[in-house]
């Protein structure tokens, strides 16, 4: 019977070209994580394998870090990373557990970046 | 049938090189981590080294950081782990492992025997 729960950041939002963590965290159970799939519509990102460690795909390479812990940070942020993320804890003897995460990247700030009036 | 079969293992001297070949069969290469543990008499099995999407990605235990080198030949689905600067605690029975990207299950090869002498 799979006992255990997942926690996530949830709903994110974060500026055009920043970073962003995602975290998730398995509580409420004693199996063991054997690998944690970090998933984008499909498409996988990276994956923290028990055994054999951290691996990122190659077409996020340049963007993806691991870390901290079984989180993931994504960094120079455009508007086209807004979506879903999953992460899947792959678990025994439980099986899989799945948790959700929304980010929505924004365009950065008007009083960052936008036009600067001087007073005469 | 997945296959993991382990070559070139052998007895070297201390400070000599050899080179591991792991050849995979029964599955999609590209689809799996690929690496390499070692359990030497007496010891639990440790991880030395992995290597995935095509290369892109390698990891190394530090005991080996700077001596060996994984790589991986997808025409061939071989993974290749070559030692240098060989050291007697580096005796171990060295074993093949693959992951799957998608799930982790894995597999395990046979292993092959690597003896350093002093």
């Known amino acids: 019977m799979m006992t255990g729960t997942i926690e996530t950041t949830g709903n994110i939002s974060a500026e055009k070209g920043g970073s962003i963590i995602l975290q998730c965290h398995l509580s409420s159970t004693t199996a063991q994580v054997t690998q944690v799939n970090w998933e984008q519509q499909d498409q996988l990102l990276a994956i923290c394998n028990a055994d054999l460690g951290w691996h990122i795909s190659p077409s996020f390479k340049d963007r993806v870090a691991p870390g901290p812990g079984l989180g993931l940070t994504l960094q120079s942020l455009t508007v086209n990373d807004t979506g879903e993320y999953f992460c899947i804890y792959h678990t025994y003897p439980d099986g899989t557990y799945t948790g959700r995460i929304f980010l929505e990247v924004l365009e950065s700030s008007v009083a960052e970046h936008g036009a600067r009036f001087q007073i005469p | 049938e997945v296959q993991l079969v382990e070559s070139g293992g052998g007895l070297v001297q201390a400070g000599g090189s050899l080179r591991l070949s792991c050849a995979a069969s029964g599955f999609t290469f590209s689809d799996y981590v690929m690496g390499w543990f070692r359990q030497a008499p007496g010891k639990e099995r440790e991880f030395v080294s992995a290597?995935?999407?095509?290369?892109?990605?390698?990891n190394y235990a530090d005991s080996v950081k700077g001596r060996f080198t994984i790589s991986a030949d997808n025409a061939k689905n071989t993974v290749y782990l070559q030692m240098n600067s060989l050291k007697p605690e580096d005796t171990a029975v060295y074993y093949c492992?693959?992951?799957?990207?998608?799930?982790?299950?894995?597999?395990w090869g046979q292993g092959t025997q690597v003896t350093v002498s002093s």
């Open positions: 290597i995935s999407w095509s290369g892109t990605n390698t």
């Open positions: 492992a693959t992951r799957a990207l998608r799930d982790g299950r894995g597999y």
